[in-house]
Every structure is written in C-alpha cells, then in structure tokens.
C-alpha cells in the first residue's frame, strides 16, 4: 500500500518578481488523497511566521493537483517578503519551503519586468 501524505510542492528558494499595484496570485501546489486539508498562508517576520487570516484565499482544483491561492489585489510595497503555506493533516502540521516576493514600487521602477519574468512560476508544476 502506497503512503498517502498531504504534500506541498514549493521548491527551495522559489521567488517571484512583481509590481506594486498589479494583482497577483501566490499559489501553493497541494496534493492530497481523500479529504482536502486545511491550508493556510503565513508571512515570515523574524523568527515567526505570522498567519494571514484576514486575506483573500481560494482553491483551484486541477486533475492531479490543487492550488491554494493567496490573492494580492493589488500588490502593495509592504507585501515584499517571504511566505510559507502550511497544511494540517491527521494532526500533523507540514510547512512548505518559503517563497519570496520581490515587490518593485511602480514609482521607482525604471522599467516594467518582462512578460516572461512576471509569468515565471518557480514552484513545481505537476505534470
């Protein structure tokens, strides 16, 4: 019998470069077997990861994987920083690698990041 853990697929040192003022969706790829786990986002602040309980989140279900999405509408300069998603599974807590947002303030941006850069998804796409 194969093990059936909840799994979080954020790679080591994943990062996104984004513009303040734009909308952005930060995705946590989650794989689970039967019941969808309770997943949350938190933002690293010193030695703690502060839960983002009042932020808009949603699920996107695909064939082999699901995505727990943290919405930024719009991105603010102070959204800069590192985030983790975490899941509660059979009374175990699993936490993803951190994913870092580099926010460029439009006022100080000399040029807009490329389309490729904006669309880049350093987390692992499940195929």
């Amino acid at each position: 019998k194969e093990s059936c853990d909840v799994q979080l697929y954020i790679k080591r040192q994943s990062e996104h470069s984004i513009l303040a003022g734009d909308p952005f969706e930060l995705e946590c790829p989650v794989k689970y077997c039967a019941n969808r786990p309770h997943v949350t986002w938190c933002k690293l602040n010193g030695t703690t990861c502060v839960k983002l309980e009042d932020r808009q989140t949603s699920w996107k279900e695909e064939k082999n994987i699901s995505f727990f999405i943290l919405h930024f509408e719009p991105v603010l300069p102070n959204d800069n920083g590192s985030y983790r998603c975490s899941a509660n599974f059979q009374s175990n807590l699993i936490e993803s690698h951190s994913t870092t947002l580099y926010v460029t303030d439009v006022k100080s941006a000399s040029e807009r990041p490329s389309k490729d850069e904006m669309a880049s998804r350093p987390w692992l796409l499940y195929r």
Partner: antibody, heavy 118, light 106 residues
Framework: QVQLKESGPGLVAPSQSLSITCTVS????????VNWVRQPPGKGLEWLGM???????DYNSALKSRLSINKDNSKSQVFLKMNSLQTDDTARYYC????????????WGQGTSVTVSS | SIVMTQTPKFLLVSAGDRVTITCKAS??????VAWYQQKPGQSPKLLIY???NRYTGVPDRFTGSGYGTDFTFTISTVQAEDLAVYFC????????FGGGTKLEIK
C-alpha cells in the same frame, strides 16, 4: 511500507562512469522527490542532487558537470549516473526520499558501496 | 553553498548525561534545519525537522532548537543505544550537512 534500495557495481575503474539504481516501494515517484547522498568511508554526508516529481533536477554545484539523475515512474526507479570517477569518489551512495514538504529526508535506503580502484 | 559548522566532533559521555551539539550556518537558513542519527553500519535516520519538530516515533529525550544561523540539538538523558554519529543539515537551499558529531558512551 516505504522502502528504497540501491544497487550498483561495487567496483569502478578510475576515469570510468558510475551507474546506480534506486528502486522504491510504498510510495510513488509521481508524488515525492528523491535525493542522492554519499558518504566516504569514515567521513560525513554529501548531498549529490535530487529529482523532483516532474523529472526536473537539482544538483550539487561542485559536482553538476559530472552528474545526471533520471527516473522511470512506471518502474519506480531512480537512476544516478556519475562520470569521470576518481579514487575520492569511493563512498557509500544512498538514495533518500523527501518529506512531503521537501524540507528533510525521511526515508533512506541502506546504501550501496562503491570503490574506485584499478 | 551554505556551510554548516558542527561542534563538537566527538563526545564521550556516560549514560544519563545531558548532551548538546551545535550547528552554525554560514548564512541565515530560517528554520530549515534537520538532524539525523546514524548508528554504526546503518543509514541515517531523521530525528528532527523544522529545527525543532520531532519526527514520528522519535523519543522525547531528543530535542532541537534554533533559528537563522544558530542551532542546537540536545539529548536530555543519554542512553546506551544513542551511540551514533549525529548530523545537522540545512535545506534552505542546495542541501549541506554538518561534519558530524560522534557520540561515544563511557
């Protein structure tokens, strides 16, 4: 239950290449990453690289030019290939499964001993 | 790559003693640190992850702590079966291990 088992040649001549297979059971390679770690006799552990669920790879930068990691999901096998072996590549080679969050290695094989000698 | 400096290299202790091993990272690794135990002739076994979380089935005499660059692994009351080499490992980026601490029992 979760198991990983390495199989290799045992003895490799200097300048030749090394191929090791890690056969896993109790979990699917479409769900977990697998790492390769080696340990020279009486020494510490050195991470070589890993293969993610989609087949993409990460390598130890110092060994990247000599390493290749692949897998066959249907056969539940992960393959390590290392080129241009020298005597200091003599070590025990382990495969190890990533935890579900990718932040530690929770199951290890028993390792396969590789000696580089003429 | 991140260097994990582990001290001491050797520990000779009596059963019942308290043991502390430290690991210092060359840059901040958040809490992305694991500790492993390798008994003679065996493969490594995961003891601690997220710097302080005990892995399933690991006795509570094993504890870990730390954040950023400084990490500590403690065995509160050493037992004879704890004879092993202990390794720290960072997983913040390309994984690296400490050099190991060989624990010997008097």
């Amino acid at each position: 239950q979760v198991q990983l088992k390495e199989s290799g040649p045992g003895l490799v001549a200097p300048s030749q290449s090394l191929s090791i297979t890690c056969t896993v059971s109790g979990f699917s390679l479409t769900g977990y990453g697998v790492n390769w770690v080696r340990q020279p006799p009486g020494k510490g552990l050195e991470w070589l690289g890993m293969i993610w669920i989609d087949g993409s790879t990460d390598y130890n930068s110092a060994l990247k030019s000599r390493l290749s990691i692949n897998k066959d999901n249907s056969k539940s096998q992960v393959f390590l290939k290392m080129n241009s072996l020298q005597t200091d590549d003599t070590a025990r080679y382990y495969c190890a499964r990533d935890r579900p969050d990718g932040r530690a290695m929770d199951y290890w094989g028993q390792g396969t001993s590789v000696t580089v000698s003429s | 790559s991140i260097v994990m400096t582990q001290t001491p290299k050797f520990l000779l202790v009596s059963a019942g003693d308290r043991v502390t091993i430290t690991c210092k990272a060359s840059q901040s690794v958040s809490n992305d640190v694991a500790w492993y135990q390798q008994k003679p002739g065996q493969s490594p076994k995961l003891l601690i992850y997220y710097a302080s979380n005990r892995y399933t089935g690991v006795p509570d005499r094993f504890t870990g702590s730390g954040y950023g660059t400084d990490f500590t692994f403690t065995i509160s009351t050493v037992q004879a079966e704890d004879l092993a080499v202990y390794f720290c490992q960072q997983d913040y980026n390309s994984p690296t291990f400490g050099g190991g601490t060989k624990l010997e029992i008097k």
